[in-house]
């Protein structure tokens, strides 16, 4: 008999795909709960455990966590399994803000700046590496240079533009070497002339239910790459959208509940109600993903009196054109995931 998660959903913080043969079962079904729910200390959320069985007090910063004993989501905690390789069974609750990064086998701390090579300056933020170029891509003058080419020059870090004339003899593309700064000169130029960069939002971390989407942006006073995150919910897990597809149709691109609703997050309720749109599903092997969306700020009020706000993906329109092995799994063909950064901000 099946003891696996429903195929249309993904864990909020999936453990890495490693050897899990020795992983203990923390969830036991049928559910077994204590006679009465626990009383949680002030400020600790009373939540349903990760097995969807019993009420439990959410694990706090530094506490052990498992598939069953989950970290307090409204405190911005997640379960860091990195210290339990290769089982990834027991983790430690950590701040989402404090996740380190690994790049080319080297581990960097959250907030740490480093230069993996002479061409980039990078910063580790919340598990994501954001890099800014030290080599400015100065475009060659097009009028007098019919065949521009970037070449490596011995002793210089950054490539330089050269112009190949008809005699195939390379020459510099500008009279006064303006296209070739060395690394130090380019750092100064970078700080004088910050190139604003905001990456596209990453796909939602779950194909249904509450997930997280992130992006890197250096649009700030320091011109420093920072990770932004927002909550996302592509479609509810507990609504069978297939039943809403009209006869003769294969897809329902957008699903919108009739009634407005309040968002809930770890027992906290949004201070106003919303009528969100969700992406639908297809009967065939296509996926539906957002293509017109924006980010809104949602304020939450908690039973203990605390309040907080979160950025949330607001879907305006979806399209159903991606091929995928599981119609609800946007990760199946992530390599071909289109970049809608221009229209999905």
């Amino acid at each position: 008999t099946a003891l696996s998660p429903a195929p249309t959903t993904m864990d909020f913080t999936p453990a890495p795909l490693e050897d899990t043969s020795s992983r203990p079962q923390f969830c036991k079904w049928p559910c077994e709960c204590p006679p009465s729910p626990p009383r949680c200390p002030l400020g600790v959320s009373l939540i349903t455990d990760g097995c969807e069985c019993c009420k439990m007090c959410a694990q706090q910063l530094g506490d052990n966590c498992t598939e069953a004993a989950i970290c307090d989501p409204h405190r911005g905690l997640y379960c860091d399994y990195s210290g339990d390789r290769p089982r990834y069974a027991i983790g430690v609750c950590a701040q989402v803000v404090g996740v380190g990064c690994v790049l080319d086998g080297v581990r960097y701390n959250n907030g740490q700046s480093f230069q993996p090579n002479c061409k980039y300056n990078c910063t580790c933020i919340d598990g994501a590496v954001g890099c800014t170029p030290l080599c400015l891509r100065v475009r060659p003058p097009r009028l007098w240079c019919p065949h521009p080419r970037r070449v490596s020059i011995p002793g210089h870090c950054c490539e330089q533009w050269v112009c190949e004339d008809d005699a195939k003899r390379p020459r510099k593309t500008a009279p006064r070497d303006t296209g070739a700064f060395d690394a130090v000169g380019e750092v100064e130029a970078w700080h004088r002339n910050c190139i604003a960069y905001t990456s596209p939002w990453s796909p939602c971390s779950t194909s249904c239910g509450l997930g997280v989407s992130t992006r890197i942006s250096n649009v700030n006073a320091q011109c420093w790459p920072e990770q932004e995150s927002r909550l996302c919910n592509l479609r509810p897990c507990d609504v069978d959208i297939h039943t809403l597809i009209k006869a003769g149709k294969k897809c329902l691109a957008v699903y919108q509940p009739e009634a407005s609703m309040n968002f809930t997050l770890a027992g906290c309720i949004s201070t106003r109600s919303y009528q969100p749109k969700y992406c639908g599903v297809c009967m065939d092997n296509r996926c539906c993903i957002p293509y017109k969306s924006k980010t809104i700020d949602v304020s939450f009020q908690c039973p203990d009196g605390l309040g907080f706000s979160r950025q949330v993906l607001w879907i305006n329109a979806c399209f159903c054109n991606l091929s995928c092995r599981n119609p609800n799994d946007i990760f199946a063909d992530l390599e071909s995931y289109p970049d809608f950064s221009e229209i999905a901000n």
Epitope: T1, A2, L3, S4, P5, A6, T8, T9, C27, W29, P30, C31, E32, C33, P34, P35, S36, T48, C51, E52, C53, C54, G209, C237, D238
Partner: antibody, heavy 121, light 107 residues
């Protein structure tokens, strides 16, 4: 009061499909696991499938695995059972039942009145 | 799958009698067993949960006992409305399984 009402039962040909619904009222639907249980004419009760409160975990009896799909819509307080490749052995009254997980797992504390599914040519 | 064997499969008794129905599990299920009453054309109704706890609203003449593999349902002082079929259910592990039923008839 707490109530479960099944619908969708019908006469269907072998190999055919049918979708049962169960409408719930009188309790917080999204707090409970829900199940389908069936009873062939003149026979005993047989558990069919269970689904967790937010559809993340699902369990099936071996006899229906790969043919039946349980689902729920918490916004509509509804439970569903999609039945495909039906055979005469699936002829039964189908009950939806609420699992009592409020204070440990204690089986089914609330049942619907049942809906009859007949598979015959 | 855990098998539940009920005995007897049918039983004749008179109003006022004390009757006992037994349910035996093929392996230990702790106290994860319930008893259900079903009347013709009706849905089952839970009488006992956790082997010995009485469902609210159920008359106290119904009682349950046992743990592990042996369980009993006792009705002390049968009433006319008690004539029905009784099932035990184990919910210790999936798949949930029911006993084959005990039909209680008027003598």
């Amino acid at each position: 009061q707490v109530q479960l009402v099944e619908s969708g039962g019908a006469l269907v040909q072998p190999g055919g499909s049918l979708r049962l619904s169960c409408a719930a009222s009188g309790f917080t639907f999204s707090d409970h696991w829900l199940s389908w249980v069936r009873q062939a004419p003149g026979k005993g009760l047989e558990w069919v499938s269970s689904i967790s409160s937010s559809s993340r975990y699902i369990h099936y009896a071996d006899s229906v695995k790969g043919r039946f799909t349980i689902s729920r819509d918490n916004a509509k307080n509804s439970l569903y059972l999609q039945m495909n490749s039906l055979s005469a052995e699936d002829t039964a009254v189908y009950y939806c039942a609420r699992e009592d997980t409020s204070m440990a797992t204690n089986g089914f504390d609330v049942w619907g009145q049942g809906t009859m599914v007949t598979v015959s040519s | 799958a855990i098998q539940l064997t009920q005995s007897p499969s049918s039983l004749s008794a008179s109003v006022g009698d004390r009757v006992t129905i037994t349910c035996r599990a093929s392996q230990g299920i702790r106290n994860h067993l319930g008893w259900y009453q079903q009347k013709p054309g009706k849905a089952p109704k839970r009488l006992i949960y956790a082997a010995s706890s009485l469902q609210s609203g159920v008359p106290s003449r119904f009682s349950g006992s046992g743990s592990g593999t042996e369980f009993t349902l006792t009705i002390s002082g049968l009433q006319p409305e008690d004539f029905a079929t009784y099932y035990c259910l184990q919910h210790n592990s999936y798949p949930f399984t029911f006993g084959q039923g005990t039909r209680l008839e008027i003598k």
